[in-house]
């Protein structure tokens, strides 16, 4: 059988959700001394990306310029060293936003519950789109999809205290082109306790996931990397 | 601070229509909902619908779908209750409630309306 | 639709004494239960949530208790200022419904 480096871990630096004509820079994190790393767009080659010194850095960042609907897809990478090539990356959904209008964002009962309570979210815009996208803030990844002419609903059912946040909804006119962001709504849920005071909502760390990793190699690295080398041999 | 106004009363003929409103100030009219009560003397209150003003949303009880009819006016932050075909069971007080935190804790002074010939 | 039963429509009590009205759902409110205060002006005032939670500005002689179907309202020390009619409402599934309301009165 062909022999394949292991794949490369493909993120988005910031986030996956880029506006219309801003730049998008998407990290390949591969191998210390992989010499070429490719962006592959929708199955096609996108980019390729020369490492310099390739031995020294562990990965690269791919920029693109002016974001539009074009742009936006699902991307992938693979990286070689020497002349071996690695297996493809997962792929990663590059969404292009600020596309045409701005929706509403609204909640029911209200933006303040009590823990237990049915809650929904409504997103409303009037282009036309059938499409509608929820999304709390620092957890972008976990995207809320639901359907309707002009207005849209999110049953969140009886909420916790883990739903307090801020969210936002788009309006979508393919998987990968969003309209503005709504308005925040921030949504506050006291517990059972019986101290009735706000709670803060949870800090809105940026998603993880969304943090390109590159790191340059030490000498220290370099040792535990040769190491790790010279075990794997051991144990073929 | 939080005022609902309403006018105090309302005068209509059997089978005509009346338009109530609701003025609100001291808070984000767009961002909460809101809610029409009936009370009839001696009947308990009855809640007829809410909406949302900032898309016009509407949610009615069933009994009130084809009585009432809600809607707003976000440029002067008034919510309309349109009430149709009166007759003497709709003579009662109509309030108009929001809730800001977690149950009905802003009420207006409610208006009184008379149906009679 | 959940129904909501008071079953006294009126109370009369001296002032200094402490009054319970009690409030029956036809199904499970899940505690989503409020308790409303009508003065005889048809001023109207929110008084306790989700059962037992003291809204804002209400004096501490009002408490609210129950689970389930049954809830009550109490009112440690009638003072003048109370005379009203007290309702309840579930706030569990829509429409929201309210009780009867009960009229307390001083003897």
């Known amino acids: 059988p062909k022999q394949t480096l292991p794949k490369p871990i493909i993120r988005a630096e910031s986030t996956y959700m880029v506006p219309k004509e801003k730049q998008a820079t998407l990290c390949c994190q591969g191998s210390y001394g992989a010499v070429e790393y490719q962006l592959h767009f929708e199955g096609s080659l996108f980019a390729v990306e020369r490492p310099k010194p390739p031995e020294r850095i562990n990965g690269v960042k791919f920029h693109i310029p002016d974001m539009n609907s074009r742009k936006a897809g699902r991307y992938s990478c693979i990286y070689r060293v020497g002349e071996l090539w690695s297996e493809r990356s997962d792929l990663l959904d590059l969404v292009v936003t600020e596309m045409y209008d701005t929706p509403t964002l609204s909640v029911h009962p209200g933006p303040e519950v009590t823990s237990g309570e049915k809650v929904t979210f409504y997103c409303r815009l009037d282009t036309a789109t059938s499409m509608f996208l929820l999304l709390k803030e620092g957890r972008s990844r976990d995207v809320q999809r639901s359907y309707g002419k002009v207005q849209a609903e999110f049953p969140m059912g009886p909420v916790t205290t883990a739903h307090r946040g801020s969210y936002r909804c788009f309006g979508s006119y393919n998987n990968y082109a969003w309209s503005f962001p709504s308005e925040p709504v921030k949504l506050l849920v006291t517990g059972d306790i019986e101290n009735t005071s706000l709670a803060p909502t949870d800090p809105t760390f940026p998603d993880s996931w969304d943090t390109c990793l590159l790191t340059r190699e030490t000498g220290l690295q370099k040792d535990l990397a040769l190491w790790d080398h010279t075990a794997q041999n051991l144990l073929r | 601070q939080v005022q609902l106004q309403q006018p105090g009363a309302e005068l209509v003929r059997p089978g005509a229509s009346v338009r109530l409103s609701c003025k609100a100030s001291?808070?984000?009219?767009?961002t909460y909902w809101m809610h029409w009560v009936k009370l009839r003397p001696g009947q308990g209150f009855e809640w007829?619908?809410?909406?949302?003003?900032?898309?016009?949303?509407?949610n009615y009880n069933e009994k009130f779908k084809r009585k009432a009819t809600l809607t707003v006016d976000k440029s002067s932050s008034t919510a309309y209750m349109q009430l149709s075909s009166l007759t003497s069971e709709d003579s009662a007080v109509y309030y108009c409630?929001?809730?800001?935190?977690?149950?009905?804790?802003?009420w207006g002074q409610g208006t009184s309306v008379t149906v009679s010939s | 639709d959940i129904q909501m039963t008071q079953t006294t429509s009126s109370l009369s009590a001296s002032l200094g004494d402490r009054v319970t009205i009690s409030c029956r759902a036809s199904?499970?409110?899940?505690?989503?239960l409020n308790w409303f205060q009508q003065k005889p002006d048809g001023t109207v005032k929110l008084l306790i949530y989700?059962?037992?939670r003291l809204h804002s500005g209400v004096p501490s002689r009002f408490s609210g208790s129950g689970s389930g179907t049954d809830y009550s309202l109490t009112i440690s020390n009638l003072e003048q200022e109370d005379i009203a009619t007290y309702f309840c409402?579930?706030?569990?599934?829509?429409?929201?419904?309210f009780g009867g309301g009960t009229k307390l009165e001083i003897k």
């Open positions: 409630a929001i809730r800001l935190r977690f149950a009905l804790d802003y």
């Open positions: 001291g808070y984000t009219f767009t």
């Open positions: 007829i619908g809410e909406i949302n003003p900032g898309n016009g949303g509407t």
């Open positions: 199904q499970d409110v899940r505690n989503f």
């Open positions: 989700f059962t037992s």
């Open positions: 409402q579930q706030g569990n599934t829509l429409p929201p419904t």
